[in-house]
């Protein structure tokens, strides 16, 4: 028998520095977690103590904090090289700055293979990107070899900016021939490493013949065997065992997100490359693990540029940006409109001639808007200003909901109106009218939504049985502020870009902004 230790991360999302327990900015260092310096300490400890170790990343290193905003992926290449990752799969967020934003900072600088078998380049891009990412890689580990085959969510064109010269094929269809090719090369230990979410990971384990282990990402899935060490609730045991169509037991793993845990899986193979046993658990990277001094020093060196950036002007406002709780928790506020407009703008993807865009709607809890921005400071807007408005380090995500769920959400928005509670919704691509004289649960008297399958966008009444795409904060997607119906009834959820980054990019693009209160939210006469 031959034993392999797989260490894995996924959806790190630019958390190079240690974070608080909820993966936001670290405040009390003695209780902070994760970060590349701490990760390196743990990885090095395991490499020292165990013979056959692979360090893998399942994508979405890009996007999530000011580190990515400023360094645009150079930080990912630099620190992943320093940690000596063995391989990485491309995630959807690796395309957030277009193909060029992937090629230059990461693909050309990484000293480890970057993989995806189901992304095929065409046209002029094919020769430019050739060899910079690979469908698979055979890695020597001790006296053996291990094949790693990569995959990426085929939804990436709807979630990021890969352009028109990359085709995202069905994962299973694309993986099978690559695994078959590895088998012909006498590689009998094969890991599928990819970024399509836990459901697809399980399907790959079931359907792709010859895959021994699946290491996934995208869905931020936390798996754990036993009593979990922090706040995350396990979606299943670690590893999650799938019985393949040809009768093999295939372990599937993921390690939550944000570098909070290091996935730790031990696999025992027989001489024919069959998995005999698999066990492990994610390791919580808490403060009992010291930060490696050399990596930490490097982080501090790179940090200097971030501090300078946060005070630079992104753009100007010529109007007061009303992000006060007195406004945003009671009525339409122009800060809410600005943020929702930025959220939609960030999700413009012209992928189908029948649709002007794939999504037109935004909802945003008023309680998530934490500060106004005064225009009387020469109109200047900085990252620092936006961090006061959106201090929680969340993301603006894409969900699919039925109209009936949206109706419930808007009823919840005003079910206890008047108490300055955070669930009051700010909107984009939606016109809502409330009648507060009616009983809670029956106060939405009009709900019109902007069409997407149209050449001239216009507002149509919400249809209860239709499925709609909506951009919203991850806080709402996870049922925050009492929006349990969203969490329970959503049909799809893809995590998006860092909230501040979305708004800052929009302001930089617009240069001068002047959002108005324009009648998106109305109250019927006599009730307000």
């Amino acid at each position: 028998a031959w034993e392999l230790t797989i260490l894995h991360t996924n959806d790190v999302h630019s958390r190079l520095e240690q974070t608080s327990e909820d993966s936001s900015k670290c405040v009390n260092a003695s209780r902070c977690m994760g970060g590349v310096a701490r990760l390196f300490t743990k990885v090095q400890q395991i490499r020292r103590a165990e013979p056959n170790v692979l360090l893998l990343d399942a994508g979405d290193q890009y996007q999530g904090t000011i580190w990515f905003t400023v360094y645009k992926g150079a930080e990912v290449a630099h620190f992943m090289n320093a940690l000596r990752y063995d391989a990485m799969a491309l995630g959807n967020h690796e395309f957030d700055n277009g193909v060029e934003g992937l090629i230059e900072p990461l693909l050309k600088e990484a000293k480890f293979p970057i993989l995806s078998a189901n992304i095929k380049a065409k046209g002029p891009l094919a020769s430019q990107i050739s060899g910079l990412y690979l469908p698979y890689k055979v890695l020597p580990v001790g006296d053996e070899v291990v094949g790693i085959v990569g995959y990426t969510s085929k939804e990436t064109p709807f979630l990021s900016n890969p352009g028109t010269n990359l085709v995202f094929e069905d994962e299973i269809t694309a993986l099978q021939p690559e695994v078959d090719k590895l088998k012909t090369l006498n590689v009998n230990k094969i890991i599928a490493l990819g970024h399509s979410g836990f459901e697809m990971d399980k399907l790959i384990a079931q359907k792709v013949r010859g895959v021994d282990v699946v290491v996934g990402g995208h869905s931020n899935t936390f798996l754990y065997t036993g009593n979990p060490p922090s706040k995350e609730v396990p979606a299943g045991k670690y590893p999650f065992i799938v019985t393949s169509d040809d009768g093999r037991k295939v372990p599937v793993v993921q390690a939550y997100a944000f570098g909070k845990y290091l996935g730790y899986l031990k696999i025992e193979f027989d001489e024919r490359g069959n998995v005999i046993s698999s066990h492990g658990n994610p390791i919580l990277l808490n403060s009992s693990i010291p930060e490696d001094p050399s990596i930490k020093a490097d982080i501090n060196k790179w940090r200097i540029k971030l501090d300078n950036y946060s005070t630079q002007e992104l753009g100007k406002t010529i109007v007061y940006l009303d992000g006060s709780s007195q406004s945003c928790r009671f009525r339409e506020c122009n800060m809410g409109n600005l943020i929702c407009d930025a959220m939609i703008n960030n999700n413009l993807r012209h992928t189908d001639e029948m649709f002007w865009n794939h999504v037109s709607m935004c909802i945003l809890n008023g309680g998530g808007i934490r500060s106004p921005i005064d225009e009387r400071n020469n109109g200047t807007i900085t990252w620092e200003n936006l961090a006061a408005v959106l201090p929680f380090g969340g993301t603006f995500d894409l969900v699919q909901l039925k109209g009936s769920t949206l109706k419930k959400a808007f009823e919840h928005s005003v079910h206890r109106y008047g108490q300055s509670t955070g669930e009051f919704l700010q909107v984009g691509g939606i016109h809502v009218v409330y009648d507060l004289s009616r009983k809670p649960g029956d106060r939405v008297v009009k709900l019109d939504v902007l069409c997407t399958k149209c050449r001239v966008p216009s507002y149509d009444p919400l249809k209860m049985d239709e499925v709609y795409k909506v951009i919203l904060p991850n806080f709402l997607a996870n049922g925050g502020d009492g929006f349990q119906m969203i969490k329970d009834e959503l049909l799809r959820h893809d995590s998006g870009d860092q909230d501040i980054n979305v708004v800052s990019t929009y302001i930089s693009k617009m240069k001068v902004i002047y959002p108005a209160v324009e009648g998106r939210i109305k109250f019927s006469t006599g009730s307000h």
Epitope: T41, Q44, Q45, R48, A49, E50, Y224, T225, G226, N227, P229, Y238, Y264, K266, H279, G280, N281, P282, I283, L284, N286, S288, I289, P290, D292
Partner: antibody, heavy 123, light 113 residues
Framework: EVKLVESGGGLVQPGGSLRLSCAAS????????MSWVRQPPGKALEWLGF??????????EYSASVKGRFTISRDNSQSILYLQMNALRPEDSATYYC??????????????WGTGTTVTVSS | DIVMSQSPSSLAVSVGEKVTMTCKSS????????????LAWYQQKPGQSPKLLIY???TRESGVPDRFTGSGSGTDFTLTLSSVKAEDLAVYYC?????????FGSGTKLEIK
């Protein structure tokens, strides 16, 4: 007072099974790596394996001599460490010690030892 | 596996004498990342459980008398008792915790003349 007390030793036939327990007290059990070490009569110490702390996933490592036959587990709620021994052989006869490793990162030496429990494998 | 070799296997000394015992590892126990040697020393008195004396090759466990000193680096380590007392009658074991499986030396038995 920090204390480890083993129990469950005794006489067992070759091929038989035995479960040893180790009751821990005087410290936060969940924070510590716990090991089993044995010592055949008149011989040297042999590390059998450990179970990691809660933060590190409570996963296990074993020495080759017992891997597949012995299983280490822990009950964090009751602060008890277990050693399940199957397919016992005469050469497994020894005093079995439960040990603790310090809480600090990478300190895999043993700062607290139990009093030991004796296992005899004989027909 | 890392093999730990101890010498001598036994020695007899008079009370008040200085005693030195050695421990050699089959590979270096010095870890370049932190410049620490992953070696511990234990004392086991007759009929008792082992007791930690030294860790990181030279750091004395709290409560251990300062007549016990650990030294060495890489593959060669020494435990020195500067002035032996009658209560030091015991077997002394070294242990590496550099990599799995953790291994002990075969012990040095200290007898009092």
């Amino acid at each position: 007072e920090v204390k480890l007390v083993e129990s469950g030793g005794g006489l067992v036939q070759p091929g038989g099974s035995l479960r040893l327990s180790c009751a821990a007290s005087g410290f936060t059990f969940t924070d510590y790596y716990m090991s089993w070490v044995r010592q055949p009569p008149g011989k040297a110490l042999e590390w059998l394996g450990f179970i990691r702390n809660k933060a590190d996933g409570s996963t296990t490592e074993y020495s080759a001599s017992v891997k597949g036959r012995f299983t280490i587990s822990r009950d964090n709620s009751q602060s008890i460490l277990y050693l399940q021994m199957n397919a016992l052989r005469p050469e497994d006869s020894a005093t079995y010690y439960c040990t603790r490793s310090p809480i600090y990162f990478d300190n895999w030496y043993f700062d607290v030892w139990g009093t030991g429990t004796t296992v005899t494998v004989s027909s | 596996d890392i093999v730990m070799s101890q010498s001598p296997s036994s020695l007899a000394v008079s009370v008040g004498e200085k005693v030195t015992m050695t421990c050699k590892s089959s590979q270096s126990l010095l870890y370049s990342n932190n410049q620490k040697n992953y070696l511990a020393w234990y004392q086991q008195k007759p009929g008792q459980s082992p007791k930690l004396l030294i860790y990181w090759a030279s750091t004395r466990e709290s409560g251990v008398p300062d007549r016990f000193t650990g030294s060495g680096s890489g593959t060669d380590f020494t435990l020195t008792l500067s002035s032996v007392k009658a209560e030091d009658l015991a077997v002394y074991y070294c242990q590496q915790y550099y990599s799995y499986p953790f291994t002990f030396g075969s012990g040095t038995k200290l007898e009092i003349k």
